[in-house]
Amino acid sequence: ELCDDDPPEIPHATFKAMAYKEGTMLNCECKRGFRRIKSGSLYMLCTGNSSHSSWDNQCQCTSSATRNTTKQVTPQPEEQKERKTTEMQSPMQPVDQASLPGHCREPPPWENEATERIYHFVVGQMVYYQCVQGYRALHRGPAESVCKMTHGKTRWTQPQLICTGEMETSQFPGEEKPQASPEGRPESETSCLVTTTDFQIQTEMAATMETSIFTTEYQ
């Protein structure tokens, strides 16, 4: 159920998960000069029951000054799938996710956490895209990507977002600013059934979100 690949990367855009599906893993990575405590968890895991989801395990880092090496934590064999790294530029300000059962909110930072977060997403995860600072959306179709299971393989849907330098775009007068459309890729372009995901609940949530939620940069 883990997604085999990373979400698509769009030039000059970042993506963000607003909530993490149960089964998502977050590697316990420490910043340079620190390491995981000896008996510490390798990763945090989003788990839950019908009414509540939360992150199991806690990440803990300790100084590695007493060691000769300060090497980064390497993923264990079960974590060797392609990973998505996310740079923590500022503290998270997650939106209220009480209306999204089966999902965990962004875990709070831990002491001496690495500058990147490495998530292992699961089927049904949705991420949202926006242009980085200094760029704007020339075109915005559905600006999200969902990890789906198709023919027994996982794949991410393609977000329809084109980012351009702010001085490079001509806009017709009187045109409204584009909004993300809730529809995914049309069925006519999909050759077989895909596993169902909580599309509706997530797109409803997306429709109420302001761009200020993108407080973490995903590179």
């Epitope: 030039p11 020339l138 179709g141 329809q160 584009p178 529809e183």
Partner: antibody, heavy 118, light 107 residues
Amino acid sequence: QVQLQQSGPELVRPGVSVKISCKGSGYTFTDYAMHWVKQSHAKSLEWIGVISTYNGNTNYNQKFKGKATMTVDKSSSTAYMELARLTSEDSAIYYCARSYGNYPFDYWGQGTTLTVSS
Amino acid sequence: DIKMTQSPSSMYASLGERVTITCKASQDINSYLSWFQQKPGKSPKTLIYRANRLVDGVPSRFSGSGSGQDYSLTISSLEYEDMGIYYCLQYDEFPYTFGGGTKLEIK
């Protein structure tokens, strides 16, 4: 299935303008931006620009500013490109191509051959 | 503008042979590179995107690699239907720019 149907070949005199069309079908037209590409013997493939089918935003290759004008008509799911003040150097095949996520062109039109001759 | 230098401009290869075409960008393009195949009288067709991702339906004998400024397209075992012209495209920055093309013919 997804199709981009372009208008037919054009034989025009130097100095005039021509407008070629690209009609999208089999998908939600406004979800995907449209690119235009020129193919000539002299310069192989050249990217002309891209237009948002949703809001009309455009980005042009500087080389084609003043030469090409891209527009869209959402009601007919059609993208247009007008080429002005034509010269023999504009003789080429012009393609429209749909933008798709993190790679630019997943479907192409069949091409419109433009011949500028007196 | 980013200049894409593609080589060779033309080549002959035998059926079953391994073929490699290269593309060099004038600056780092962050792996935002596609490869296209074009056959006479037809529109180009995307083979590879993001430098090494194979488009659905493209035979697995095609592969892409590279990063930074240097990229390559490899056909592991040439088949007759592979003849045509191959182009690279950078889409890291506007304006998008194509390589000059490589004409691949069968010996």
